[in-house]
């Protein structure tokens, strides 16, 4: 058992059939001595007396609010929250796995540029009694400074029959320099809770693995005379890292017909311009990726050709 | 990225072609050796990363653009000194700055290809003949070397009279690409910053 | 005590169906995940299938993904296994299990695929 | 498809010490517990080792686990009649958990 925060307390149990449980000695916060009972939740059977209690839980009927009273006052107050352990591994209900960049992905992490602030997000299916709390830092042993926010709904989807919500958390490593090269990863770890039910999941990245930039801004089509050719030109995303010279990034030019079926050109340019053919109906697109680094491509910034 | 690629002319900056391509060699080398090495720990957020030119070079804080000076954090140690005379600096007017910039840059390449040239003799003596290093990136980081053109001490390739343990060699080899290609990564960008200046 | 009686084992044609069942007792069932696994005769052991203990996800063996559902009724106390388009290598005792560090097995019951 | 592997047979005669390699990777064994099973004939398999060195209650203490990097072994010290049965070893995979991934399964023989 271990505290997770005032007067909230986690119980890991090996979680399966008949198991024995852990025994928990739960003790009131009172200089009282005499006259003490105790009793579960919202019920007011009495499940002992005296300054401490001991019970042995096995089950999320054994969690829960337990209260201490004397004379018809509460004196204190101990939640017990139960964490799974399933075969040596931790219950993993509350959140979604969402598979990318690949299985028991639960958490997804995502910057637009090297200035140490980046966006995590999961997804559950369970749209009550649930909170999260989030922490991070860069490396374990030795951690240094990140700063997050409150986790917040971000999104809800209809995913079949089901209701989907997205929760998503900013943070922002308190001393980033953005040209650093990263030898300690961040961590970060949201605890999640349920009704009476605890867990933990965690994610460990460099920056440079998870940029992804904005789209190019100022997507522009200028016409190229006597010709089907045009010229496309755009600009670096505002939030792209500064100076661009030494953060710079490589693009690719893309024009679809208005068909998915028909074929796209494609041109890779490290340029903010480049000459291709419009074809009637077709739409000419623009994305961004970091040109020394292999990190994620941008969404695509979109003009029609005509 | 195997794609076609419109690069633009390196012109006025020697050193700007050569990065290019050292950072093609090592990313290259580096896929080889995850993909050879599949039952080895060689993955990014397997291995430690470890800096072989910590407290030794510091190519990032000496080549930080000028616009991240401002920036408390990129300034925690500038004060390392080297030699000042290479010829990436031949047709322009360079400031020190700049001159330690590359010439800490060479220190790292130097530093890099003895590693690597070491680690190579190794494992040319393993039974398995598994992996080796890729001739094209050793021959890459000399061209580089070359452009950038500081005298400096030689540093004589070490020798070690006992028998390899091939398996920790190729988690060495792993983890030195890792960090080479960051390194490598740094490069590329303070030459094309250099170039645009 | 915890006991897992298992039924619906039989012998079947090449690509018909077959439902086989797994009563829980003794325990609360719709607290635990479960597993299929099966054994052809003279060989090994083979996981099949995976439920979470609120039926909420599940999982499957390439070999029967898109033939076999797993799916249970927590008010019923039972776990179930639909075979369809079954195929002579889908010969086996199947057993089914409770998910967790100590587990318990069910007696096993004899599938046999054959025309 | 089995990761996992596992002699097919080890013998050994009554109270010698006889030990079941079980080799797996890193993304199974390297990351997870392992189980040992033994089955006899015509019955369900039966625990005997559980997060990679610990006997169920019941288990005779002639068994015991213990896991290595990505290998496990399971060792009956003093082998006995009784223990001539079919034994198993079992993880997972940390990217298809909760899939089980079972070994090739190893015939112990007790001779004379």
């Known amino acids: 058992i271990w505290e997770l925060k005032k007067d909230v307390y986690v119980v890991e149990l090996d979680w399966y059939p008949d198991a024995p449980g852990e025994m928990v000695v739960l003790t009131c916060d009172t200089p009282e001595e005499d006259g003490i009972t105790w009793t579960l939740d919202q019920s007011s059977e009495v499940l002992g007396s005296g300054k401490t209690l001991t019970i042995q839980v096995k089950e999320f009927g054994d969690a829960g609010q337990y209260t201490c009273h004397k004379g018809g006052e509460v004196l204190s107050h101990s939640l017990l929250l139960l964490h799974k352990k399933e075969d040596g591994i931790w219950s993993t209900d509350i959140l979604k796995d969402q598979k990318e960049p690949k299985n028991k992905t639960f958490l997804r992490c995502e910057a637009k540029n090297y200035s140490g602030r980046f966006t995590c997000w999961w997804l559950t299916t369970i749209s009550t009694d649930l909170t999260f709390s989030v922490k991070s830092s860069r490396g374990s042993s030795d951690p240094q400074g990140v700063t997050c926010g409150a986790a917040t709904l971000s999104a809800e989807r209809v995913r079949g029959d089901n209701k989907e919500y997205e929760y998503s958390v900013e943070c922002q490593e308190d001393s980033a320099c953005p040209a650093a090269e990263e030898s300690l990863p961040i961590e970060v770890m949201v605890d999640a809770v349920h009704k009476l039910k605890y867990e933990n999941y965690t994610s460990s990245f460099f920056i440079r693995d998870i940029i992804k930039p904005d789209p190019p801004k100022n997507l522009q089509l200028k016409p190229l005379k006597n010709s089907r050719q045009v010229e496309v030109s755009w600009e670096y995303p505002d939030t792209w890292s500064t100076p661009h010279s030494y953060f710079s990034l490589t693009f690719c030019v893309q024009v679809q017909g208005k068909s998915k079926r028909e074929k796209k050109d494609r041109v890779f340019t490290d340029k903010t311009s480049a000459t291709v053919i419009c074809r009637k109906n077709a739409s000419i697109s623009v994305r961004a990726q970091d040109r020394y680094y292999s990190s994620s491509w941008s969404e695509w910034a979109s003009v029609p050709c005509s | 990225r195997n794609l076609p690629v419109a690069t633009p002319d390196p012109g006025m900056f020697p050193c700007l072609h050569h990065s290019q391509n050292l950072l093609r060699a090592v990313s290259n080398m580096l896929q080889k050796a995850r993909q050879t090495l599949e039952f080895y720990p060689c993955t990014s957020e397997e291995i430690d990363h470890e800096d072989i030119t910590k407290d030794k070079t510091s190519t990032v804080e000496a080549c930080l653009p000028l616009e991240l000076t401002k920036n408390e954090s990129c300034l925690n140690s500038r004060e390392t000194s080297f030699i000042t005379n290479g010829s990436c600096l031949a047709s322009r007017k360079t400031s020190f700055m700049m001159a330690l910039c590359l010439s800490s840059i060479y220190e790292d390449l130097k530093m890099y290809q003895v590693e690597f040239k070491t680690m190579n003799a190794k494992l040319l003596m393993d039974p398995k003949r598994q992996i080796f290093l890729d001739q094209n990136m050793l021959a890459v980081i000399d061209e580089l070397m070359q452009a950038l053109n500081f005298n400096s001490e030689t540093v004589p390739q070490k020798s070690s009279l006992e028998e390899p343990d091939f398996y920790k060699t190729k988690i060495k080899l792993c983890i030195l690409l890792h960090a080479f290609r960051i390194r490598a990564v740094t490069i590329d960008r303070v030459m094309s910053y250099l170039n645009a200046s | 005590q915890v006991q897992l009686v298992q039924s619906g084992g039989g012998v079947v044609q090449p690509g018909r169906s077959l439902r086989l069942s797994c009563a829980a007792s003794g325990f609360t069932f719709s607290s635990y995940g479960m597993h299929w696994v099966r054994q052809a005769p003279g060989k090994g052991l083979e996981w099949v299938a995976f439920?979470?203990?609120?039926?909420?996800?599940?999982y499957y063996a390439d070999s029967v993904k898109g033939r076999f559902t797993i799916s249970r009724d927590n008010s019923k106390n039972t776990l179930y296994l639909q075979m369809k388009s079954l195929r002579a290598e889908d010969t086996a005792v199947y057993y089914c299990?409770?998910?967790?560090?100590?587990?318990?097995w069910g007696q096993g019951t004899m599938v046999t695929v054959s025309s | 498809s089995y990761v996992l592997t596992q002699p097919p047979s080890v013998s050994g005669t009554p109270g010698q010490r006889v030990t079941i390699s079980c080799s797996g990777g890193r993304s199974n064994i390297g990351s997870n517990t392992v189980k040992w099973y033994q089955q006899l004939p015509g019955t369900a398999p039966k625990l005997l080792i559980y997060g990679n060195d610990t006997r169920p209650s019941g288990v005779p203490d002639r068994f015991s686990g213990s896991k290595s990097g990505t290998s496990a072994s399971l060792a009956i010290t003093g082998v006995q009649a009784e223990d001539e049965a079919d034994y198993y070893c079992q993880s997972y995979d940390r990217g298809t958990h909760p899939a089980l991934l079972f070994g090739t399964g190893t015939k112990v023989t007790v001779l004379g």
């Open positions: 439920i979470r203990y609120d039926g909420s996800n599940k």
């Open positions: 299990k409770t998910h967790g560090s100590h587990d318990n």
